[in-house]
C-alpha cells in the first residue's frame, strides 16, 4: 500500500533571466527512494539516480544544475520555461509518485520572492 | 555525425597498465557523460563506469573500482580509461560508448580496443 | 546486482519469419531497458531504449515491450541485415547490467 505524500513548492514565480529551484519532498513513508526524473511537461530534464548519480538531458546541460539534493536548479530562465514541472519518484517497495510544480516566468520585476525554494 | 574512435590494438605486459583513449567527434563532449564496457568472448558485456565529461564526476561498477579509472581531456574531447595491475583476465575489447539523451543507457559505441595481456 | 536472464540464447530463422527474444529481470526496472543489435566483429547498437522507444534510424519492424520484470524484443519479417548477437541491459541502478545475449542465425 503507498502511504507516502509528495509535498512540491506548487506554484511559484521568477524573473526572467533568474534561477529558480524546483524541490520535492517525499513523505510519510520509509520506501527508499530508488530514482527521481524531473520532467517539464513530456520532456525530460534530468533523473537522479541513486545509486548512479545524475542524467542531465543534454538538450537542458548547459542551464540546468543538479540540486540541492534531490532538487533541480534552472538557470537563465526564458518566459518559454513557463510551464508544469513534475517530480516523479520511484521507490522501493512503495511504487512510483508524482509531484507537480507550476512555475511562471515573469518579464519583469513583478516575480514574487514568497516562494519557498525559490533563490533570491 | 557521431563519432567515438577508439585505437584497435593494445598489447602490453602483465603487471602494467595501461591508458585507453576515446576521441569524441560530431557533437558537444561536455553535455554528453561517456560509458566504458568490457567484452570477453563467451563472458557477455560488462559495464565498468561512467563519467561526466563536463564535471570529471564518475561512477564506477564496484567490481572495477581499483582496476579502472576514468578522466577526460576537455580540450581534445577525449575519454580515457586507465587499466592497472594487468592480468590475462584483463584481455578483452573494450568500448567506449555516449550515454543517451533520456538515460543511463549508451547511444552511440566507439569499435573498441583490443587489449592482450601477455609476456 | 540486477540479473538479466535473456531467452532464447540461441535462434535460428529465415529471412521474412518473424521472431521475439525475450528479457526477464531480478527486479523491477519500470520501463527502464534498452535493446542492443552486435554483429561479429563490430560494437553494439542501439535498437530500442525505455523498453518500447525505438532508437534513431532503427526499421520499424523492430518493436520493444514490456515494464516492471518482463521485457521483450520482437522482430518482424527479418531481413538479411538482421542476423546477429542481441542484448537486454537495464539503465536503472548501479551496475548496469546486460543479459547474455541470444545468437540469431540463419535457419
Known amino acids: 500500500m503507498m502511504t507516502g505524500t509528495i509535498e512540491t513548492t506548487g506554484n511559484i514565480s521568477a524573473e526572467k533571466g533568474g534561477s529558480i529551484i524546483l524541490q520535492c519532498h517525499l513523505s510519510s513513508t520509509t520506501a527508499q527512494v530508488t530514482q527521481v526524473n524531473w520532467e517539464q511537461q513530456d520532456q525530460l530534464l534530468a533523473i537522479c539516480n541513486a545509486d548512479l548519480g545524475w542524467h542531465i538531458s543534454p538538450s537542458f546541460k548547459d542551464r540546468v544544475a543538479p540540486g540541492p539534493g534531490l532538487g533541480l536548479t534552472l538557470q537563465s530562465l526564458t518566459v518559454n520555461d513557463t510551464g508544469e514541472y513534475f517530480c516523479i519518484y520511484h521507490t522501493y517497495p512503495d511504487g512510483t509518485y508524482t509531484g507537480r510544480i507550476f512555475l511562471e516566468v515573469l518579464e519583469s520585476s513583478v516575480a514574487e520572492h514568497g516562494a519557498r525554494f525559490q533563490i533570491p | 555525425q557521431v563519432q567515438l574512435q577508439q585505437p584497435g590494438t593494445e598489447l602490453v605486459k602483465p603487471g602494467a597498465s595501461v591508458k585507453l583513449s576515446c576521441r569524441a567527434s560530431?557533437?558537444?563532449?561536455?553535455?554528453?557523460?561517456m560509458h566504458w564496457v568490457k567484452q570477453r568472448p563467451g563472458r557477455g558485456l560488462e559495464w565498468i563506469g561512467r563519467?561526466?565529461?563536463?564535471?570529471?564526476?564518475?561512477k564506477y561498477n564496484e567490481k572495477f573500482k581499483s582496476k579502472a579509472t576514468l578522466t577526460v581531456d576537455k580540450l581534445s574531447s577525449t575519454a580515457y580509461m586507465q587499466l592497472s595491475s594487468l592480468t590475462s583476465e584483463d584481455s578483452a575489447v573494450y568500448y567506449c560508448?555516449?550515454?543517451?539523451?533520456?538515460?543511463?543507457?549508451?547511444?552511440?559505441w566507439g569499435q573498441g580496443t583490443t587489449l592482450t595481456v601477455s609476456s | 546486482d540486477i540479473q538479466m536472464t535473456q531467452s532464447p540464447a540461441s535462434l535460428s530463422a529465415s529471412v521474412g519469419e518473424t521472431v521475439t527474444i525475450t528479457c526477464r529481470v531480478s527486479?523491477?526496472?519500470?520501463?527502464?531497458l534498452a535493446w542492443y543489435q552486435q554483429k561479429q566483429g563490430k560494437s553494439p547498437q542501439l535498437l530500442v531504449y525505455?523498453?518500447?522507444t525505438l532508437a534513431e534510424g532503427v526499421p520499424s519492424r523492430f518493436s520493444g515491450s514490456g515494464s516492471g520484470t518482463q521485457f521483450s524484443l520482437k522482430i518482424n519479417s527479418l531481413q538479411p541485415e538482421d542476423f546477429g548477437n542481441y542484448y537486454c541491459?537495464?539503465?536503472?541502478?548501479?551496475?548496469?547490467?546486460f543479459g547474455a545475449g541470444t545468437k540469431l542465425d540463419l535457419k
Open positions: 525505455n523498453a518500447k
Open positions: 560508448a555516449r550515454e543517451g539523451h533520456y538515460g543511463f543507457y549508451s547511444d552511440y
Open positions: 541491459q537495464h539503465h536503472y541502478g548501479n551496475p548496469l547490467t
Open positions: 563519467i561526466d565529461p563536463d564535471s570529471g564526476g564518475s
Open positions: 560530431g557533437y558537444t563532449f561536455t553535455n554528453y557523460y
Open positions: 527486479e523491477n526496472i519500470y520501463s527502464y
